[in-house]
Interface confidence: low
């Protein structure tokens, strides 16, 4: 997160860290807890690494440096990547993770509400992006979970800024014209949440952007409302019944 500040314990209890055990272990992406056994993240986090046992999912944490070999983590039972996602493109950048074991909800570990299907009418004015990603383009993963308040921009405005890419109605953009505040590398897959009528909703999944926090280069997020049918279909067919946190 560029231009952000430290988060507090329990402020974003749905935020998870997706870590990969390579020769060493490292944080790779964020994600959002949406049910006892479900995490929503970006499909591109699994490009080339879809093997379940490589991944460790840490929930209910604030500081990555607090993680030790004894820190409990969740393992993956199933990775469900959107069927139309292609490695070479930015479209349909959404994936579901089914955890091997359900998580208990606590003050520091609980789900984010999902938007209503095809939610286009709500005007969100209080939106935040969170993650442990870089604090500048040539930066490094941050220890303490960062947060930043960023306004949504219209898709029309966003398309003007990304002439070489197609900004679809299944994407949502956020950023300041002057730049300075944005998601960055390592924040991918994490949440763009907006507070509306006193309730936080998962509006976007951090997906891509040209650099980080550049002037007139907003961040691009997967628009969760456009994928509600897919989310419900996949979680219900796997569970028998939905266990999502939905405002409706």
């Amino acid at each position: 997160i560029v231009g952000g500040t430290n988060s507090s314990w329990g402020e974003w209890p749905w935020q998870v860290s997706l870590q990969v055990k390579l020769t060493a272990q490292r944080h790779l992406c964020g994600g959002s807890l949406i049910g006892h056994q479900w995490v929503l993240t970006a499909a591109h986090c699994f490009d080339g690494l879809p093997l379940q046992d490589v991944w460790r999912i840490y929930s209910g944490i604030l500081n990555l440096s607090d993680i030790t070999k004894d820190t409990p983590f969740s393992q993956i039972k199933e990775i469900i990547i959107h069927q139309n996602y292609k490695v070479s493109e930015g479209n349909h950048d959404i994936a579901l993770i089914k955890l091997q074991a359900p998580l208990n909800y606590t003050e520091f570990q609980k789900p984010i509400c999902l938007p209503s299907k095809g939610d286009t009418s709500t005007i969100y004015t209080n939106c935040w992006v969170t993650g442990w990603g870089f604090s500048k383009e040539k930066g490094e993963i941050q220890n303490i979970l960062q947060k930043v308040n960023i306004p949504l921009v219209t898709n029309e405005e966003c398309q003007k800024r990304y002439q070489d890419y197609k900004i679809t109605q299944r994407m949502v953009c956020a950023g300041y014209k002057e730049g300075g505040k944005d998601a960055c590398k390592g924040d991918s897959g994490g949440p763009l949440v907006c507070k509306h009528n006193g309730m936080w909703r998962l509006v976007g999944i951090t997906s891509w952007g040209e650099g980080c926090a550049r002037r007139e280069q907003p961040g691009v997020y997967t628009k969760v409302a456009e994928y509600m049918d897919w989310i419900l279909e996949k979680t219900q067919s796997s569970d028998g019944k939905a266990q999502m946190q939905s405002p409706a």
């Epitope: 790779l28 080339g48 879809p50 093997l51 991918s188 891509w208």
Partner: antibody
Amino acid sequence: EVQLLESGGGLVQPGGSLRLSCAASGFTFSHYIMMWVRQAPGKGLEWVSGIYSSGGITVYADSVKGRFTISRDNSKNTLYLQMNSLRAEDTAVYYCAWRRIGVPRRDSFDMWGQGTMVTVSS
Amino acid sequence: DIQMTQSPSTLSASVGDRVTITCRASQSISSWLAWYQQKPGKAPKLLIYKASTLESGVPSRFSGSGSGTEFTLTISSLQPDDFATYYCQQYNTYWTFGQGTKVEIK
């Protein structure tokens, strides 16, 4: 854990042959371009050969063209380098390597094996 | 074939020094350049790709710049762990490495 593990190196006489293998684990081997890179004792890195994901496209450095053949078996997650007509100057540590580089703001990975030594000497 | 020329071949420096290594391509490679660090007996480690993008987990004292044919790797404040050999590598057309720059203790 993501790993590349080379094998098949050893001592061979000039004009002889060797087949190197590189067993991959922990990532979707079939999606990615794989490479062989070598390093002669006390020298720099030299790219040897590459093979695209399907195996249909192979490329070679001029120094090995016509003598070395790269191949892959995606069902076994294994990369191969068949080395014929070996010369003293082919003596080196041979590494297999893979890189994934994402689109804007996405992560990259770079994975190399530990290398296998090939010595060409009479 | 694209040739990569690195300079200097050897560089003597002290802890805390700012170190710059340059790499020149024989033809334009856009930003398709990577920098590696290698220590004796070890496989190379990726530091920077796409000319200026820092690989995850690499300290921010490393930075890369340039495009086209001229590229630079800078270590802003040399640390004891940074004494090693550094290679540039183009991947515009297959792979080609520079001949390497050994950074040694002055």
